[in-house]
């Protein structure tokens, strides 16, 4: 297993609409054909997978159907957006790269993205 | 060219096994996915699953979870698709097609499941 | 499972008319592929990534859309467009394709 630096944004605020967006960017030192991109979230000392997807050649990531993540490609950068997100889910949120194919494998994690979500404060009863 | 060449049409029995085979050739084969589709007669399309020729990673649609199992030979650049308890209902045309774009198609296996 | 629902499931129309089909996804996905059959052949790539159209199609075929509401258009039609049209999703898995458009001569 080699290391490979992996960049993110330090800090993200999520939108109005519970979803935040931010760039996941990989040094490759080869042309990887097959990626492996996992979205970990890191609150309170505890890690868990928040999505994964595997991509090849194609720009879109394909997540399983459950998943609160969508993302797309481009060189050695991953877009990725994820949806549905509440205050409760403010916390770090790191990119993990792993260049699966060809050999060598490479496993490179960012540093994390702070997410921060605000619930949006209830409409006021209007008079109309 | 790119091509994606399927092997010939099979008649097996319910409760058997068929496995269909995929041969790539004028591209290369560890870049691409190798899907496979099936086609019931006079019916939709329908995805079982894929695979990343590297690595082998595979992902399956849950219909088939337990009954398909999609392998890959490097070495020949042929990727392979094996369904497993066959019913009647199986009988279809099974194509494989490569990427995530499903740009090129192989030319399809009929598989009749008939007693 | 995202499920695609196409319509019109059947589309009579003739030579040079203009025609649209529409791909309706049960939940926003972020791009959609289309693909062309006729009986007894494999399917072809027509148009991917919502809009861009695939190696070798004619112009006179389009896609647009966005979320959950895609549609292809023919701008001419031509004889041998008379086929049966896939829309598709891979924003997640399963892979979904819609149950098809049957394109017939009128």
């Known amino acids: 297993c080699k290391a490979m630096h992996v960049a993110q944004p330090a800090v993200v605020l999520a939108s109005s609409r519970g979803i935040a967006s931010f760039v996941c960017e990989y040094a490759s030192p080869g042309k990887a054909t097959e990626v492996r991109v996992t979205v970990l979230r890191q609150a309170d000392s505890q890690v868990t997978e928040v999505c994964a997807a595997t991509y090849m050649m194609g720009n879109e990531l394909t997540f399983l159907d459950d998943s609160i993540c969508t993302g797309t490609s481009s060189g050695n950068q991953v877009n990725l957006t994820i949806q549905g997100l509440r205050a409760m889910d403010t916390g770090l949120y790191i990119c993990k790269v792993e260049l699966m194919y060809p050999p060598p494998y490479y496993l490179g994690i960012g540093n994390g993205t702070q997410i921060y979500v605000i619930d949006p404060e209830p409409c006021p009863d209007s008079d109309f | 060219q790119v091509q994606l060449v399927q092997s010939g049409a099979e008649v097996k029995k319910p409760g058997a096994s068929v496995k269909v085979s995929c041969k790539a050739s004028?591209?290369?084969?560890?870049?691409?996915?190798i899907n496979w589709v099936r086609q019931a007669p006079g019916q939709g399309l329908e995805w079982m699953g894929r695979i990343a020729p590297g690595s082998g990673t595979t992902y399956y649609n849950e219909m088939f979870t337990g009954r398909v199992t999609m392998t890959r030979d490097t070495s020949t650049s042929t990727a392979y698709m094996e369904l497993s308890s066959l019913r009647s209902e199986d009988t279809a045309v099974y194509y494989c097609a490569r990427g995530d774009y499903f740009d090129y198609w192989g030319q399809g296996t009929m598989v009749t499941v008939s007693s | 499972d995202i499920q695609l629902t196409q319509s019109p499931s059947f589309l009579s129309a003739s030579v040079g008319d203009r025609v649209t089909i529409t791909c309706s996804a049960s939940?926003?996905?972020?791009?959609i592929h289309w693909y062309q059959q006729k009986p007894g052949k494999a399917p072809k790539l027509l148009i991917y990534d919502t809009s861009t159209l695939a190696s070798g199609v004619p112009p006179r075929f389009s896609g647009s859309g966005s979320g959950p509401e895609f549609t292809l258009t023919i701008s001419s039609l031509q004889p041998e467009d008379f086929a049966t049209y896939y829309c598709q999703q891979r924003t997640t898995y399963p892979l979904t394709f819609g149950q098809g458009t049957k394109l017939e001569i009128k």
């Open positions: 004028g591209y290369t084969f560890t870049s691409y996915w």
């Open positions: 939940k926003s996905v972020s791009y």
